[in-house]
Interface confidence: low
């Protein structure tokens, strides 16, 4: 049968060789996972399965995305008689697509006497290994480097049965088994020099075409057994209709209507209901930069700005734990929100000999450079002697207040002799409670900081026995002249609440880089942002007005209609299927002729790089 | 599921301003166009004025009628589009419709429900 597109698909495993339960069991497992089955979207792997299993309901599997395993089973026969490809995406062992050994019980007769894999015309990766199959025939009698397409691929087929019936004559010594009907059907080996995969004849017009897996009927893309890469509606194609294509009036990839997803190897409109999109796949599950998030009803994985979300438990009332200590460090890895508190007492910085808890590696409190909010409040009793900052918590956003510390306090700092700034440089609101900071004889800034604008309500301070504010200037501890009036955390540009001029990645600095410099820059409010990469260093003049490749004053390689570009669009997909451009003299980029397939050096059809279309074979484009 | 939610439309003079506004009812993560259509009975649905945005600068596109009395602006923020309407013609009647789209790798696209615009005397 022909490429089709709905299919039957289920999920393979991933046990390996490890069983839970008797035969029976097993069995009833396998019964489940692949009656009905066409495509195993991952392995098949069938082990200790006992010699009465009737396992004709696995007839119907066309596809193992995976790899196959066999092995330590009993049954006479592995009835797969419409598996047509093996993809290996995963392999057995480090590299074996399939994988049949020690399928006999030796107590018995009972074994593996017939892999019925008549139609099996392909592993797309990986190699074989049948080996140690007492009773298993007709292994060697098949030419395995037709079906596997991978030249290098290991193939080890030895110790099998050793008294075998030979093929039927029909077969010309390529067998499954004895019967006229169990002939090996040959793809690859037999196809004339001309053909670059698979074929249906032996004649040089007989050659399949490049996306077909396994075989075909016909030359066409819609005569395949299977597919290479990707069946859309019928037809194997090297990728599903991606997410974006290039729209030639603007110049900018833009939403396809018409996109699909990759789901195993067939393309579909939409992903089934327990997968997500991740770019044009169906997944699983998000991976660990991404987070999943709902679209116009669409569930799809969307990077994350830096770390993922994560949500921690916290310290203090209501939580495990009385403070922050070595036997709960290690919990606070990767958070970004706490729920809850966080307390910094004696006993979890010095150990608690009675709780049998270990002093703490001052070191390991960088863990929580990835907080950016605290939902309940922040007490710090106690802080390593070496540390004079809080810097740690140097990405602390939001102090929640949901929780409050004794007299309702949200933020508490006391009796930290070392301390000299607070370093809370992105704090920027706390949200409920009372601010208390007391005897840390060494703390300079703090009374800098405007808390009325970090606060939602009038703000409530109780701020006293610091370093007296006079000491502090005479000290020249007094925030730096790049700060605004809004006050500052601690010394140098990075920690003031705002600047007097403009800021660079939280950094504040006298102008931005706009007519010199290495790296060019825009300003968006008081904030530099660097030129987009494609835009050309102007010397004494302005590179760009914005962060786009279409806001530079001169482009540094080409430019596509209003965008800078690399390199002009080479084989880029478009409406009507792939784009390619060269650049002129003043480095534009400009249309190829219609016919060119592979790219070209000017416009004309003689200007195309490699083969050119016939000019009745592709519809004139318009740019 | 997000929503978009239009306002600001209504019956106004030749010559009269109007500011329509437009937000999303939820947050949309990487919003990096968006843009107002006009659609007139018989007519198909018209790009009016449309801003995209790389990162947080904006670039905007007029149709030629809109050229010089109507300002686009999006705040990416709050998830939100304005279009100033200056010197209004009886042409510049029609429903108004707002999109916002995710121009990138998996990308989505949310259009509003549309606001009546009505210039007459």
């Known amino acids: 049968s022909e490429v089709g597109n709905s299919q039957a698909v289920c999920p393979g495993t991933l046990n390996g060789l490890s069983v839970t339960g008797d035969a029976e069991n097993q069995y009833q497992t396998l019964y489940k996972l692949y009656e009905r089955c066409e495509v195993v979207m991952g392995n098949l792997e069938i082990v200790l399965t006992g010699h009465n299993a009737d396992l004709s309901f696995l007839q119907w599997i066309r596809e193992v995305t995976g790899y196959v395993l066999v092995a330590m089973n009993e049954f006479s026969t592995l009835p797969l008689p419409n598996l047509r490809v093996v993809r290996g995406t995963q392999v057995y062992d480090g590299k074996f697509a399939i994988f049949v050994m020690l399928n006999y019980n030796t107590n018995s007769s009972h074994a593996l006497r017939q892999l019925r894999l008549t139609q099996l015309t392909e592993i797309l990766s990986g190699g074989v290994y049948i080996e140690k199959n007492d009773k298993l025939c007709h292994m060697d009698t098949i030419d395995w480097r037709d079906i596997v397409r991978d030249r290098d691929a290991e193939i080890v087929v030895k110790d099998n049965g050793r008294s075998c019936p030979p093929c039927h004559e029909v077969c010309k010594g390529r067998c499954w088994g004895p019967g006229s009907e169990d002939c090996q059907t040959l793809t690859k080996t037999i196809c004339a020099p001309q053909c670059n995969g698979r074929c249906f004849g032996r004649a040089p017009n007989e050659c399949c075409h490049e996306e077909c897996a396994g075989g075909c009927t016909g030359p066409l893309q819609t005569h395949c057994f299977a597919c290479r890469h990707f069946n859309d509606s019928g037809a194997c194609v090297p990728l599903c209709p991606q997410p974006l294509i290039y729209n030639k009036l603007t110049f900018q990839l833009e939403p396809n209507p018409d996109t699909k997803y990759q789901y195993g190897s067939v393309c579909v409109r939409s992903c089934p209901h327990n997968f997500v999109v991740d770019q044009s796949s169906c997944v699983r599950a998000c991976p660990s930069n991404k987070m999943e998030v709902e679209k116009n009803g669409l569930k799809m994985c969307e990077p994350c700005a830096g770390l993922c979300p994560k949500a921690c438990e916290g310290t203090g009332a209501g939580s495990h734990y009385q403070t922050v200590d070595s036997s709960n460090i290690d919990s606070f890895v990767n958070c970004t929100k706490i729920l809850g508190n966080l307390d910094f007492l004696i006993t979890g910085l010095e150990g608690d000999p009675w709780r049998n808890i270990s002093a703490l590696d001052p070191e390991k409190l960088n863990v929580f450079r990835t907080v950016r909010e605290i939902t309940g409040y922040l007490n710090i009793q106690s802080w390593p002697k070496h540390m004079h900052n809080f810097s740690v918590f140097s990405n602390l956003e939001t102090i929640g207040g949901r929780s409050l510390y004794n007299r309702g306090f949200s933020l508490l700092i006391m009796k930290n002799d070392n301390v000299t700034s607070l370093g809370l440089r992105s704090l920027r609101e706390v949200s409920a409670g009372r601010v208390y900071i007391t005897e840390n004889r060494r703390l300079c800034y703090l009374h800098t900081v405007q808390w009325a604008a970090l606060s939602r309500r009038r703000a409530d301070l109780d701020i006293r026995n610091n370093k007296p504010r006079g000491k502090c200037q005479q000290e020249g501890k007094v925030c730096d002249p790049l700060c605004s009036a809004d006050g500052c955390w601690g010394p140098g540009p990075a920690q003031c609440l705002s600047c007097r001029h403009y800021s660079r990645r939280g950094v504040c600095v006298e102008s931005c880089s706009f007519t010199q410099g290495e790296t060019r820059e825009f300003a968006e409010g008081t904030e530099c942002f660097e030129c987009h990469p494609e835009c050309e260093r102007v010397e004494g003049g302005i590179t760009c007005n914005g962060s786009g490749a279409d806001t530079c004053t001169r482009c540094a390689h080409y430019r596509d209609g209003p965008h800078c570009v690399e390199r002009c669009p080479e084989g880029i997909l478009g409406e009507r299927g792939p784009i390619y451009k060269y650049p002129d003299s003043s480095r534009e980029c400009r249309p190829c002729h219609e016919n060119c397939t592979r790219g070209c050096t000017g416009p004309l059809l003689q200007d195309c790089l490699g083969d050119a279309l016939p000019s009745a074979r592709r519809a004139p484009t318009v740019i | 599921e997000v929503q978009l939610v239009e306002s600001g439309g209504g019956l106004v003079q030749p010559g009269g301003s109007l500011r329509l506004s437009c937000s999303a009812s939820?947050?949309?993560?990487?919003?990096?166009?968006m843009g107002w259509y006009r659609q007139t009975p018989g007519k198909e649905r018209e790009l009016v004025a449309g801003i995209t945005s790389i990162t947080r600068v904006g670039s905007t596109r007029y149709a030629d009628s809109a050229k010089g009395r109507f300002t686009i602006s999006g705040d990416y923020a709050k998830n939100t589009v304005y279009l100033q309407m200056n010197s209004l013609k009886p042409e510049d009647t029609g429903v108004y419709y707002c999109?916002?789209?995710?121009?990138?790798?998996?990308?989505?696209?949310?259009w509003g429900q549309g606001t009546q615009v009505t210039v007459s005397s």
């Open positions: 999109r916002m789209s995710i121009v990138k790798s998996g990308g989505a696209d949310y």
């Open positions: 939820g947050s949309i993560f990487g919003l990096n166009a």
